[in-house]
């Protein structure tokens, strides 16, 4: 069975979060997709969305967020550049499918941004999470105002969460520090 999980990314100020959300190609290729933040006890807030219909491999930039929808592969790529401490929070990808409620994608991203020197590009402390180049063409898309009450949930308390760290043989400090936390089965 598919598990809805959280993946924790611990990054420094100035670095880039670079993640992907996969979706069912046949159902959602041209659907409008969005990147949302979920604050405890609040409705999910849409921060950026693709165009409607979503265009293939066409970067959409809203502030420091860049979305790129690879239709042919059923992948939405999300980049948040020049991260700030206040960007910390729980994020998710959703697919808009009016008049139905938005369809939530796996996995949720728990972003923790801390202050500190993020290194210089090219150093071994860095990863693609630091690397960013502005796409050649970007478009700001208008996002629907509604969000789904169904997606308002809180992460399980840390004491009861089944936390499994990445495989010990991988040095994930050079990739990004990720912890996978199942939310429900």
């Amino acid at each position: 069975a598919t598990k809805l999980t959280e993946e924790k990314y611990e990054l420094k100020e100035g670095q880039t979060l670079d993640v992907k959300c996969d979706y069912t190609l046949e159902k959602f290729a041209s659907s409008q997709k969005a990147w949302q933040i979920i604050r405890d006890g609040e409705m999910p807030k849409t921060l950026a969305c693709t165009e409607r219909p979503s265009k293939n491999s066409h970067p959409v930039q809203v502030g420091r967020i860049i979305l790129e929808d690879y239709h042919d592969h059923g992948l939405l790529r999300v980049r948040m550049v020049n991260l700030q401490v206040e960007d910390s929070g729980l994020y998710q990808c959703v697919i808009y499918q009016p008049p139905k409620e938005p369809h939530m994608l796996f996995d949720r991203i728990r972003l923790v941004v801390t202050k500190g020197f993020s290194g210089t590009p090219g150093s071994n402390e860095n990863s693609t999470q630091n690397v960013y180049k502005i796409p050649p063409t970007t478009t700001k898309a208008l996002c629907p105002l509604y969000t789904s009450p169904r997606t308002v949930t809180q992460a399980p308390p840390k004491s009861t969460a089944d936390v499994s760290t990445p495989d010990s043989e991988i040095n994930l400090t050079n990739v990004t520090d990720i912890i996978r936390v199942p939310v429900f089965n």
């Epitope: 598990k3 592969h73 796996f106 996995d107 090219g122 693609t128 690397v131 960013y132 991988i170 990004t176």
Partner: antibody, heavy 123, light 107 residues
Framework: QVQLVQSGAEVKKPGASVKVSCKAS????????INWVRQATGQGLEWMGW????????GSVKKFRDRVTMTRDTSTSTAYMELSSLRSEDTAVYYC????????????????WGQGTLVTVSS | DIQMTQSPSSLSASVGDRVTITCQAS??????LNWYQQKPGKAPKLLIY???NLETGVPSRFSGSGSGTDFTFTISSLQPEDFATYYC?????????FGQGTRLEIK
């Protein structure tokens, strides 16, 4: 340790299908995407596509889209790649590969490789 | 699709030599580039990821550099076990593509 063990060599006739299996062990199968890469004899590497074992979603490059199906059985931690309408140019070694980072990371670094499965298409 | 061009396609060198292989992308791929080593009859092995990061357990004689369109892979002092074929691979966008490979042979 992480291991990807693939099924044995296959000989197929043109027009037939082949299904290659890839059994994963040493890690949580549903946490990492499985990709498929092929290599024709004496040739370079060619990426075919990916599958997220948790969601079951997959994607493949245009040239394979109508012929390839990527599936998984989470109960046995096994990924499958089926290629149909085989032609002689599909003769190659097929590799299943696990990425370096979790499924949500946009990081396509192929860290763990299966031993490869030779598929020969000949009439 | 982004084309990756490796040069040279083959190269002869001796143990102890410094060897350099280049990889050129058809457009800017930032640092989204990996390097692999493949020995005959074996699966490829990840050596360098994100242009310059050494994969865990890979000897420090291997290194990578570059960003944008031009990348370099270097073996500082060639060892007998390093004779193999080397591939670059980008992942700046989808689809992912590999270079055609560089075969490193004993002189």
């Amino acid at each position: 340790q992480v291991q990807l063990v693939q099924s044995g060599a296959e000989v197929k006739k043109p027009g037939a299908s082949v299904k290659v299996s890839c059994k994963a062990s040493g890690y949580t199968f549903t946490s990492y995407d499985i990709n498929w890469v092929r290599q024709a004899t004496g040739q370079g590497l060619e990426w075919m596509g990916w599958m997220n074992p948790n969601s079951g979603n997959s994607g493949s490059v245009k040239k394979f889209r109508d012929r390839v199906t990527m599936t998984r059985d989470t109960s046995t931690s096994t990924a499958y790649m089926e290629l149909s309408s085989l032609r002689s140019e599909d003769t190659a070694v097929y590799y299943c590969v696990r990425l370096i980072g979790y499924s949500s990371a946009y990081k396509w670094s192929f860290q763990h490789w299966g031993q490869g499965t030779l598929v020969t298409v000949s009439s | 699709d982004i084309q990756m061009t490796q040069s040279p396609s083959s190269l002869s060198a001796s143990v102890g030599d410094r060897v350099t292989i280049t990889c050129q992308a058809s457009r800017d791929i930032s640092k989204y580039l990996n390097w692999y080593q493949q020995k005959p009859g074996k699966a490829p092995k990840l050596l360098i990821y994100d242009a310059s990061n050494l994969e865990t357990g890979v000897p420090s004689r291997f290194s990578g550099s570059g960003s944008g369109t031009d990348f370099t892979f270097t073996i500082s002092s060639l060892q007998p076990e390093d004779f193999a074929t080397y591939y670059c691979q980008h992942y700046d966008n989808i689809p992912i593509t590999f270079g055609q490979g560089t075969r490193l042979e004993i002189k």
